[in-house]
Interface confidence: low
């Protein structure tokens, strides 16, 4: 995969609102998260029971649906070592990265369909200048898609598209912490499409998350949780073919 | 075809530490999602939760009980072990394995396959 | 932790006609996200738990459609529509909403 972009510029310099090189306009974002503060909801899927938890492909045994979500062996390489060839953010002219992340990467997950729901793991946490990149294609008539940055029991960033919430698309962002969810930030604009392939990428900043989403910026999301090096893994879910998942140092 | 089977000692001595395994097949604990866990039974009794593990090593304990409940995994081996320190003769029970399923979004499944369970007495 | 609370026994059923088993929940299990985390096991006599019931509606594989399951967040009853001698066993509720988790008492359905 070749980026027609650099990220480099993303984060030297502050104060700037449209950093040259992030994904698409930057200028012109509302405050928060969406520009939804305060917004709540009474349950992501009133008068109706969930559609399960892996839509389209239920778990063997108490789970009505096609089986094979899991088909008894581990998915191959899911917890790979850094890939030998190189990866899709060239180091040239990027800041060498330190700490737990001691080269650019990216790691992750191989090239490859993988099995959904994954979990990448984030050894180390995450840490500012940490690039999260997820590629796959929303499959027809889905329902939601989620990314789950989890601290133990916690999740410090859900990050939850729903594609037919009372007829309506949006996208919810959620904090959980001692299993209670918090205030929800929700964001109108939907760049997802069922069936279409799809670019999700999360910047982690010092105090905040950026997404974009097929290189266009799409919302930020202040850190509830401030422990960032606990933040130690990333769960994958939802109505998608995962192609990859990866981690670099920008 | 998903089966599990506990195995014990049958019976032990007040003080001694149970160890437990549970041999499962038709799932693997290295699939993101599985989990597998501990609930025992006293006879005529109801169900009481004891410890889970996660595909990711994460441990869910029942901290409402004694403390010495340790559990762990060999996914390679389809195994998941439960050590309880300090037994006594309340804890005379069916120690139950059972298998669930973890959604980051959707949450917890119900526990949907159970070994038969083994029989443990603790007596003096 | 979250109490769960059942009747030991139900009220006498005869074959063929329905019957109820309540359960209720020292908290509410619904979930900000839409999903209420209760469980139904049935215990047959002599054998393992089986689920019937997760997510407070949701049937589980196998399980015939006599079983229904309904409820409030605190609230919850499971119904079985036409009592065959099979049902028999012990009925138990249980919550995965919070650590830990915890099964109601159970209860025994018993038949005329």
């Known amino acids: 995969m070749a980026d027609n972009f650099s990220l480099h510029d993303a984060l030297s310099g502050s104060g700037n609102p449209n950093p040259q090189g992030w994904p698409g306009a930057w200028g012109n974002q509302p405050a928060g998260a969406g520009g939804y503060p305060g917004a709540s909801y009474p349950g992501a899927y009133p008068g109706q029971a969930p559609p399960g938890a892996y839509p389209g492909q239920a778990p063997p045994g108490a789970y009505p649906g096609a089986p094979g979500a899991y088909p008894g062996a581990p998915a191959p390489g899911v917890y790979p070592g850094p890939p030998s060839g190189p990866g899709a953010y060239p180091s040239s002219g990027q800041p060498s990265a330190t700490g737990a992340y001691p080269a650019t990467g990216p790691y992750g997950a191989p090239a490859g369909p993988l099995i959904v729901p994954y979990n990448l793991p984030l050894p180390g946490g995450v840490v500012p200048r940490m690039l999260i990149t997820i590629l796959g294609t929303v499959k027809p008539n889905a329902n939601r898609i989620a990314l789950d940055f989890q601290r133990g029991n916690d999740v410090a960033f859900h990050f939850n598209p729903r594609f037919n919430e009372n007829n309506r698309r949006v996208i919810v962002c959620n904090t959980k912490l001692d299993n209670n969810w918090g205030r929800e930030e929700r964001q109108s604009v939907f760049p997802f499409e069922s069936g279409k392939p799809f670019k999700i990428q999360v910047l982690v900043e010092p105090d905040h998350f950026k997404v974009a989403v097929n290189d266009a910026h799409l919302l930020q999301y202040n850190h509830r949780v401030k422990k960032l090096n606990e933040i130690s893994k990333l769960g994958i879910s939802g109505d998608i073919d995962l192609t990859s998942a990866s981690y670099t140092m920008i | 075809q998903v089966t599990l089977k506990e195995s014990g000692p049958g019976i032990l001595q007040p003080s001694q530490t149970l160890s437990l395994t549970c041999s499962f097949s038709?799932?693997?604990?290295?699939?993101?999602?599985?989990?597998v866990g501990w609930i025992r039974q006293p006879s005529g009794k109801g169900l009481e939760w004891l410890a889970h593990?996660?595909?990711?090593?994460?441990?869910y304990y029942n901290t409402a009980l004694k403390s010495g409940l340790t559990i762990s995994k060999d996914a390679s081996k389809n195994q998941v072990f439960l050590k309880i320190a300090s037994m006594d003769t309340a804890d005379t029970a069916t120690y139950y394995c059972?298998?669930?399923?973890?959604?980051?979004?959707?949450?917890?499944?119900?526990?949907?396959?159970w070994g038969q369970g083994t029989s443990v007495t603790v007596s003096s | 932790d979250i109490v769960m609370t059942q009747a030991a026994f139900s009220n006498p059923v005869t074959l063929g006609t329905s019957a109820s088993i309540s359960c209720r929940s020292s908290?509410?299990?619904?979930?900000?996200?839409?999903?209420?985390?209760l469980y139904w096991y049935l215990q047959k006599p002599g054998q393992s738990p089986q689920p019937l019931i997760y997510?407070?509606?949701n049937l589980a594989s196998g399980v015939p459609d006599r079983f229904s399951s309904s409820g409030s967040g605190t609230d919850f009853t499971l119904r079985i529509s036409r009592v065959e001698a099979e049902d028999v066993g012990v009925y138990y509720c249980?919550?995965?909403?919070?650590?830990?988790?915890?099964f109601g008492g159970g209860t025994k359905l018993e038949i005329n």
């Open positions: 059972a298998r669930n399923l973890y959604d980051g979004s959707y949450g917890y499944y119900a526990m949907d396959y």
């Open positions: 038709g799932f693997s604990l290295s699939t993101s999602g599985m989990g």
């Open positions: 593990i996660w595909w990711d090593d994460d441990k």
């Open positions: 908290k509410s299990l619904l979930h900000t996200n839409g999903i209420t985390f």
């Open positions: 997510q407070m509606s």
């Open positions: 249980a919550q995965n909403l919070e650590l830990p988790w915890t």
